[in-house]
């Protein structure tokens, strides 16, 4: 999978009013990284692992890019015409990605009260707006603003998708999210379910990459994937992620099944516990 | 009190430019959101959009017609202006601006004719 | 462009009638669909914004219903004021398309 660092910005207008502050979060690698602290006006680290990428450095800089951000989308929302009585939001994404041959990849994307609207690839300068009549009026609103803006000042529209290669490379640089490796914790547990049955859940946390293969086996071979139970792979919090797995089987059979793990290479299986 | 008064020329001859004044009182197109629309109707018939301009100067016009239309605002005289080339006896139509605030026209002008005539 | 067809072109009433006006859009717009009523040489009066939402200063028999394409404008008791041709406008998207009226007169 390439690195990536991924910018998620929401504002709020009500009743036509773009209200003050912004929501912001920043994933690096897929995992919650920063997040803008609207009562200490600051960007703060999600998580031990995200303190250590940058070790005793200050968060000022991502603090002002952040803020920068939040306010140029806010000026982007007051220029969205017709906007309807009560509340609605603007949402800005922005992903850009290193692969593992050095390519790079930068787009951005648009959402007016969750709807898509408007995607541009940042290295291409590539505008795409959605086939639905709405979102052509309001990807018109906002790239006539855009427009205007970028020719009375360089904004970070034009620079974004250096400024983010260049953030992603720094946070790269420390080595904390280079290619490691963390593998799973896995844990077996069984509870009651109807008269007979057992649920059996096997669970794999504080792994990285995300990438894994978690699957019941009875007597050796996988079972049939209607009769297992997946969990989404979520982050943790941590820098690493979780996911789990669970299925029901019949009491007193409980030694013909096993959890079967596969992340990064390497591989185990997991009894149910008696 | 939000009021709009049209003004035009009344007649014109096939070829000739329309310009249009709409002047308003009570509201502010300085305000953010807010904005102001031209609407036409021949004798008779439905109603057509045709331009609108924003507070930030954002001008919106009918596809079908926009090679012949220019809108333009005076915002510290409260007017706004529509000028449209070449018209033909098909533009005979009362003309209307009206305000528009959170995607509706909400106040309308009392409206002004043109004929269109050789 | 979104097209809107208003059914039908002409309706005539009784005084006291509730009547129902037809607007329908070529394809959803949720519920950004404005109502116009104009009265005989007068200019169009905004009756009904955002498919139900009323407007301060217009009767409250006027009322109005539907969303995505599909969507009526009800007169709960016409008197004989309500005589003129209603429109419907599009505003959910650019450019913002009147239907093409409904005629309301009194039999």
């Known amino acids: 999978e390439p690195h990536s660092l991924r910018y998620n910005l929401t504002v709020l207008s009500w009743d036509g009013s773009v209200q003050s502050g912004f929501l912001a979060e920043v994933h690096l690698d897929g995992q919650p990284f920063l997040r803008y602290d609207r009562q200490k006006c600051r960007a703060k680290p999600q998580g031990q692992w995200a303190e250590d990428v940058l070790g005793n450095k200050t968060w000022d800089r991502e603090t002002r890019d952040l803020t920068g951000n939040g306010k140029d989308l806010r000026m982007t929302l007051a220029h969205i015409k017709d906007q309807k009585e009560g509340l609605h939001s603007l949402q800005e994404i922005r992903v850009c990605e290193i692969h593992e041959d050095n390519s790079t990849r930068s787009s951005q994307h648009f959402y007016y009260d969750g709807e898509l609207f408007l995607s541009q690839n940042l290295e291409t300068e590539e505008w795409t707006v959605p086939q639905s009549s709405r979102a052509q009026t309001l990807a018109m609103n906002v790239r006539n603003f855009l427009k205007e803006d970028a020719m009375k000042t360089k904004t970070h529209y034009h620079a974004m998708h250096a400024d983010c290669l260049q953030e992603l490379r720094r946070y790269l640089e420390s080595g904390v999210v280079l290619r490691r490796t963390v593998p799973p914790m896995v844990n077996v547990t069984r509870s009651e379910a109807s008269e007979g049955n057992i649920t059996v859940t096997c669970r794999a946390s504080s792994f990285y990459p995300r990438n894994i293969i978690l699957t019941w086996r009875q007597d050796g071979v996988s079972l049939s994937h209607d009769t297992q139970q997946w969990g989404d792979v979520l982050p943790d919090g941590n820098g690493t992620y979780q996911t789990w797995v669970a299925t029901r089987i019949c009491r007193g059979e409980e030694q013909r099944f096993t959890c079967y793990m596969e992340h990064s290479g390497n591989h185990s299986t997991h009894p149910v516990p008696s | 009190q939000v009021t709009l008064k049209e003004s035009g020329p009344g007649i014109l001859k096939p070829s000739q430019t329309l310009s249009l004044t709409c002047s308003f009182s009570?509201?502010?197109?300085?305000?953010?959101?807010?904005?102001v629309g031209w609407i036409r109707q021949p004798s008779g018939k439905g109603l057509e959009w045709l331009a609108h301009?924003?507070?930030?100067?954002?001008?919106y016009y009918n596809p079908s017609l926009k090679s012949q239309l220019t809108i333009s605002k005076d915002t510290s005289r409260n007017q706004v202006f529509l000028k449209i080339t070449s018209v033909d006896t098909a533009d005979t139509a009362t003309y209307y601006c009206?305000?528009?605030?959170?995607?509706?026209?909400?106040?309308w002008g009392q409206g002004t004719t043109l004929t269109v005539s050789s | 462009d979104i097209v809107m067809t208003q059914s039908p072109a002409t309706l005539s009433v009784t005084l006291g009638d509730r009547v129902s006006l037809s607007c329908r859009a070529s394809q959803s717009i949720s519920d950004y669909l404005h109502w116009y009523q104009q009265k005989s040489h007068e200019s169009p009066r905004l009756l009904i914004k955002y498919a139900s939402q009323s407007i301060s200063g217009i009767p409250s028999r006027f009322s109005g219903s539907g969303s995505g394409s599909d969507f009526t404008l009800s007169i709960n008791s016409v008197e004989p004021e309500d005589v003129g041709v209603y429109y419907c406008?599009?505003?959910?998207?650019?450019?913002?398309?009147f239907g093409s009226g409904t005629k309301l007169e009194i039999k």
């Open positions: 009206a305000r528009r605030l959170n995607g509706y026209f909400d106040y």
């Open positions: 406008q599009n505003g959910h998207s650019f450019p913002f398309t």
């Open positions: 301009i924003w507070w930030d100067d954002d001008r």
């Open positions: 009570g509201f502010s197109l300085s305000t953010s959101g807010m904005g």
